[in-house]
Interface confidence: medium
């Protein structure tokens, strides 16, 4: 499919003047390549009339011009004083004009309305509001005042003064007569519909004597905006209809066969399935204006998209509307990611987030996607080191691999947390993506304690146990807070015990706090990973208190670190399932944290062991296929 | 329960300077993103710049890029604009307002996005 996208049909009037805008994506190729308009023939063919290297034709001598624009990936062609002989099939397109890199145009110039003297002419959009005025003299001021629409041969009266209203206009017009001192009655036509278009005749009177005036109303098919975004990207339709439908239902619809539009969101809370988890319908303001956020487009989202008011939320005849028709380009410069990661029960995922690598300093965040009234996208944590009070513990983003790829690694998972989730910078907007999580049947890889308590001035060991299909990767004990999570020495005691039908390749690393301090209470991480890439992820709760007498918990799980069998395990651990997960909540509640801020320090915390490096990553369920 | 209140407003001459302060005080202000309206007498409130809680993100209007500038200090409850370059059309009453953290998906630039108002401090620049 070609990738050239502009606009379908183009219409105008003989006389005028047409600008016609065609997209291409911006390559550097594309950005230098030529340019060209030309006309097909009908027996195949197309002959150029003007390109971006000069040429120009005869037949657009002194009344065209082609201008290309390479930082937006458009070019232009402005035609002027267009006759009926410009109607005809047209392509704009790059390179050479037979191979295939174009889009088709369509260019209707037909003849302007032929018009009576003294005729006033109403250009007016559909769904929106005319209002015909109609002088009358005095000798009129208390006689019958009529509208009447021509209708072939024949006058057919619209309206009149005695209350009389034309089935077709019922609910939508009306007649007023101006205040005494002025001689003008005007009739008011609301909602207007494409059949309205024609000429109407206003009568003062209904003699010889009654004055008369012509009106040419013109109602316009809104012309669509054309976009043109990349497949997997974010477009954003801006809605504005006007004040006076304000507190009418808001919608947006998408053109199938015909004059179908299937409503994709509305304000009275219908949603289409095709869009779930990727749509957001931002508030309308006070001026009747809203927008429309749709994010992962695909090649099925191309079309025509009309947006308007109606009591009903859908499109009906007579509903103010703006239209747009959206090109999704598949030469994407948004790499593929996973849309959908699973994720096992007590678990973890790690997600990769695309962004535009030209904006790396760009702030990222992470929100989830609320289906509620329509839509919001509350966030949950950002580059800066916020994370939201109940993420606390489980949720990290992190800068690694960067390059155009961030990630995002939320552990602990219960059935709550499957969703949709949207990845955001707050640069190019373009590049919101979408990733659904998914929580499956299974066990965690990783056995980790189910909680510790380390005693003041005592040394701690935590254990944590890696099944022998991890043997390939790096492991690692890091310790959370808001900005990442900081890597911590550990020790790679052997193979671990804690897995049936698990060779010598089953890893036990442990993580050893010497001198325990109040400071060491918190989150602790262990986790798997390849590079700059992340996998599986499992968390612990270390609770610090006074010494007490000996037998305290941890002690058995020095011991099970110490000589891990069976009977100790059972005891000491736990695989954590969903159930059982020590809530982060309760330890934000314990201590009143509002939400986690590192204030002293806003700058992002490393995790690799020793490095400076920024800690990245990838689902276990997609790892290194990058 | 975020309280604002808005100074530094007065009257320069065109292509003079003036800073505008906001400070916050109730709820915690450093969880906040923060913004900058202004409203001239017969015109709608509109937007004039934003900074994110951290101050690592800023968003202005066009009309104000490069002349404008905002800034918060976390430790000291408050959020600054540095207006440059003033001309006659900036005058207006202009009000701080501060946001509950929710939603990054619009970059508060909408004055409904907004849960706490200042007053509003005057500004006016004689030609």
């Known amino acids: 499919k070609s990738p050239i996208f502009g606009p379908e049909e183009v219409n105008s009037v003989e006389g005028n003047s047409v600008s016609i805008t065609c997209y291409y994506p911006p390559t550097s190729v594309n950005r230098h390549t030529r340019k060209y308009w030309c006309r097909q023939g009908a027996r195949g063919g197309c002959i150029t009339l003007i390109s971006s290297e000069g040429y120009v034709s005869s037949k657009y001598a002194g009344r065209a011009n082609l201008t290309n624009f390479p930082e937006n990936g458009t070019f232009v062609v402005n035609i002027a004083q267009l006759s009926q002989d410009d109607s005809g099939r047209y392509k704009c397109g790059l390179g050479i004009n037979s191979r295939g890199l174009s889009f088709d145009v369509s260019l209707e110039v037909s003849q302007g309305p032929g018009l009576l003297n003294d005729t006033k002419v109403y250009t007016v959009d559909l769904g929106r509001t005319v209002t015909i005025n109609c002088p009358f003299k005095t000798e009129n001021a208390q006689k019958r005042k009529s509208l009447y629409k021509q209708i072939g041969l024949y006058p057919v009266l619209v309206i009149d003064s005695s209350g009389y209203v034309n089935p077709n206009y019922t609910g939508r017009i009306r007649l007023d007569i101006q205040g005494t001192g002025q001689l003008l009655f005007s009739v008011v036509i609301n909602q207007l519909r494409l059949s309205d278009a024609g000429q109407y005749l206003c009568q003062a009177g209904d003699d010889s004597n009654s004055n008369k005036k012509n009106a040419d109303l013109q109602v316009l098919k809104p012309e669509p905006e054309l976009v043109y975004e990349d497949l997997r990207g974010s477009v954003t339709f801006h809605c504005a209809l006007g004040p006076e439908v304000a507190n009418v239902a808001k919608f947006l619809c998408r053109q199938s066969s015909g004059e179908n539009c299937d409503v994709v969101v509305n304000t009275l809370g219908k949603r289409a399935p095709a869009f779930e988890g990727r749509i957001l319908l931002n508030p309308q303001d006070k001026d009747g204006s809203f927008s429309v956020v749709i994010t992962g487009l695909r090649k099925e989202d191309a079309g025509r998209y009309l947006c308007g008011a109606h009591s009903d939320g859908q499109l009906q005849e007579g509903s103010p509307i703006q239209a747009w028709q959206l090109f999704v380009n598949e030469e994407s410069t948004i790499p593929r990611s996973p849309t959908v990661v699973k994720g096992v029960a007590g678990s973890s995922v790690a997600v990769l987030c695309p962004y535009n690598r030209k904006e790396s300093k760009s702030i990222k965040y992470w929100c989830l996607w609320e289906g509620a009234q329509n839509g919001r996208c509350p966030l949950l944590v950002d580059s800066e080191g916020w994370v939201k009070a109940q993420y606390e513990g489980r949720l990290s983003l992190l800068e690694e691999p960067g390059n155009g790829t961030f990630t995002v690694i939320l552990n602990q998972l219960t059935s709550r947390d499957a969703g949709f989730y949207w990845c955001l910078t707050n640069g190019d907007t373009l590049w919101r993506t979408t990733v659904e999580i998914k929580i499956i049947e299974g066990e965690p890889n990783l056995k980790v304690p189910g909680n510790v308590t380390a005693v003041l001035g005592e040394t701690l060991k935590v254990p944590c146990h890696f099944p022998c299909k991890f043997s390939s990767y790096e492991k690692y004990w890091c310790k959370w807070n808001n900005t990442g999570c900081q890597a911590l020495p550990s020790q790679d005691e052997g193979p671990s015990k804690a897995f049936v039908n698990c060779d010598e390749n089953s890893r036990l690393v442990s993580l050893t706090l010497n001198l325990v301090t109040r400071a060491d209470e918190g989150w602790y991480w262990c986790g798997v990973k390849q590079g700059h890439f992340y996998g599986e992820t499992a968390a612990v709760y270390v609770a610090v208190e006074e010494r007490k007498a000996a037998g305290s918990r941890d002690v058995s799980l020095a011991k099970a670190d110490a000589a891990p069998d069976e009977k100790v395990l059972d005891s000491g651990f736990r695989e954590i399932e969903n159930k059982a997960i020590q809530d982060p909540r309760l330890f934000a509640e314990e201590k009143a944290v509002a939400d986690t801020r590192d204030q002293a320090d806003g700058s992002r915390a490393s995790v690799d062991s020793g490095s400076s490096e920024e800690q990245g990553g990838s689902s276990r369920h997609h790892h290194h296929h990058h | 329960e975020v309280q604002l209140v808005e100074s530094g407003g007065g009257l320069v001459q065109a292509g003079g300077s003036l800073r505008l302060s906001c400070a916050a005080s109730?709820?915690?202000?450093?969880?906040?993103?923060m913004g900058w309206f202004r409203q001239a007498p017969g015109k709608e409130r509109e937007f004039v710049a934003a900074?994110?809680?951290?101050?690592?993100?800023?968003y202005y209007a066009d009309s104000v890029k490069g002349r404008f500038t905002i800034s918060r200090d976390n430790a000291k409850n408050t959020v600054t604009l540095q207006m440059n370059s003033l001309k006659p059309e900036d005058t207006a009453v202009y009000y701080c307002?501060?946001?509950?953290?929710?939603?990054?998906?619009?970059?508060?630039?909408?004055?409904?996005?907004?849960?706490?108002w200042g007053q509003g401090t005057q500004v006016t620049v004689s030609s």
């Open positions: 109730g709820r915690t202000f450093s969880s906040n993103p």
């Open positions: 900074i994110s809680w951290s101050g690592g993100g800023t």
């Open positions: 307002a501060s946001r509950d953290y929710s939603d990054p998906i619009s970059l508060w630039v909408e004055d409904r996005e907004y849960d706490y």
